[in-house]
């Protein structure tokens, strides 16, 4: 015998989900035990089976789903699955807002990323906050040099993607640079993207020799390219 | 060569439905937001509709809202518009427009490349 | 929702002369990130539109030199320094910061 566990726990890891009024919304609690478990969902605490709501809910047992139809605001809230068997129980809450503004391209703060000194050797942090309507993809890319030249016969930079994430509304977004040299100087550009469009702004990270004891955290002007 | 290649227009009484199919080619349709944009014989150029690469983000013109449903196949580089409850007012040539797309944009985010279009005419 | 407002209704240009239009927009198209998402297009009699200018002022590739797109926040102007023939057409402005994304109500560029 076994107490449920989560068998894709990767599928679960948005917590929160930002939609447009009209979206179909799906959430999944993929799980397993012994004896099989089974699933009943919860909204704000209370036990829900979209009885009234308009268009209902589709429950599917087997893909540990529930599955609402065109959202509307009186669809925000909490939403739990509880997994149980005789051994013992699990449960995780998903949070659904339903937005009604217009949507809009993503809004990056500004100053961020910022500008950022290092010592070689030391780890570096750059922030991305976004503001967004709908879920953003996030890319972090870095400016490179190819052949000498740091744009292409196009005009435009070449870059190297670093990381690339998917995160919620408001969220901020991290690069990691850890043990940095040399090499990592330059410049390195938050890229914001969603159904409307993209957004994206720059930073230059300047990297002085680890001997140098002089070094101050004034940093280069801000250079953001088109 | 970067395509898009509407079908699927035609006459339809009012309160009937249609579906209009968008099919790409020459670029990486699964990372691209897709709209449809009209254009009233003789009018201006109206949005209509975007959905988002993946499919799960959509947002629609207040005039189509609840009637008009877009969708699309990344396995077989589709976009569609399901048409519902049409109306006079909807006669239009339909244009399928590429979006947004994932990553650096060389160039504009979207709304470089436009389909020939689609004509729909809503008539008793 | 934006609104964008197109003038002049019609233009009547002599080839080789200088053609303006101008756009107003009902918010500021001037984004977080700096730039400016006001797009420009011509669309020629039974195709659909193509893109002149985007991002304010950046020219499309393949966009002859002759046009040029300029402004600020609300007021936006699209300029061809020498009309030719070929340049006839409906031009819209548009503006791509938020849905509905929403167009001018177009200018008719004719030859005299």
């Known amino acids: 015998q076994q107490a449920p566990y989560w068998t894709h726990p990767q599928r679960m890891e948005k917590k929160l989900h930002a939609v447009p009024a009209g979206n179909t919304v799906k959430f999944r609690c993929p799980a397993a035990g012994n004896p099989t478990p089974t699933i009943r969902w919860l909204k704000d605490g209370q036990a829900f089976h979209g009885e009234n709501r308009i268009g209902g809910i589709r429950l599917r047992h087997q893909h540990w789903s529930l599955v609402m139809e065109s959202v509307v605001p009186s669809d925000r809230g909490t939403y739990t699955c509880l997994v149980e068997n005789a051994v013992g129980s699990i449960r995780y809450n998903y949070l659904l807002d339903v937005l009604e503004r217009s949507p809009h391209r993503p809004i990056l703060q500004a100053g961020l990323p910022a500008n950022t000194t290092a010592v070689v050797g030391s780890d570096v942090e750059l922030l991305c906050k976004v503001y967004s309507d709908a879920q953003p993809h996030i890319q972090w890319l870095k400016h490179i040099v190819i052949n000498g030249s740091s744009f292409g016969a196009d005009g435009f930079p070449y870059v190297q993607v670093l990381k690339t994430a998917d995160i919620n509304s408001s969220e901020v977004e991290v690069l990691y640079l850890r043990n940095v040299s040399a090499e990592d100087a330059g410049e390195y550009t938050c890229l914001a993207g969603n159904s409307i469009g993209l957004s994206y702004q720059s930073a230059w990270l300047t990297v002085l020799p680890e001997e140098d004891p002089t070094w101050t955290a004034a940093a280069p002007e801000a250079r953001y390219t088109d | 060569e970067v395509q898009l290649l509407e079908s699927g227009g035609g006459v339809v009484q009012p309160g009937r439905s249609l579906r209009l199919s968008c099919a790409a080619s020459?670029?990486?349709?699964?990372?691209?937001?897709m709209h449809w944009v009209r254009q009233a014989p003789g009018k201006g150029l109206e949005w209509v509709a975007v959905i988002s690469y993946d499919g799960s983000n959509k947002y629609y013109a207040d005039s189509v809202k609840g009637r008009f449903t877009i969708s699309r196949d990344n396995s077989k580089n589709t976009l569609s518009l399901q048409m519902n409850s049409l109306r006079v007012e909807d006669t239009a040539i339909y244009y399928c427009?590429?979006?947004?797309?994932?990553?650096?944009?060389?160039?504009?985010?979207?709304?470089?490349?436009w389909g020939q279009g689609t004509m729909v005419t809503v008539s008793s | 929702d934006i609104v964008m407002t197109q003038t002049p209704l019609s233009l009547s240009v002599t080839p080789g002369q200088p053609a303006s239009i101008s756009c107003t927009s009902s918010r500021s198209l001037l984004h977080s990130d700096g730039k400016t998402y006001v797009y420009w297009y011509v669309q020629k009699s039974g195709q659909p539109p193509q893109l002149l200018i985007y991002e304010l002022s950046n020219r499309f590739s393949g966009v002859p030199d002759r046009f040029s797109g300029s402004g600020s926040r609300t007021d936006f102007t699209l300029k061809i320094s020498r009309v030719e023939a070929e340049d006839v057409g409906v031009y819209y402005c548009m503006q791509y910061v938020e849905a509905p994304l929403t167009f001018g109500g177009g200018t008719k560029v004719e030859i005299k």
């Open positions: 427009v590429r979006g947004a797309g994932l990553g650096w944009p060389y160039g504009p985010d979207g709304f470089d490349i």
């Open positions: 020459g670029f990486t349709f699964s990372s691209y937001a």
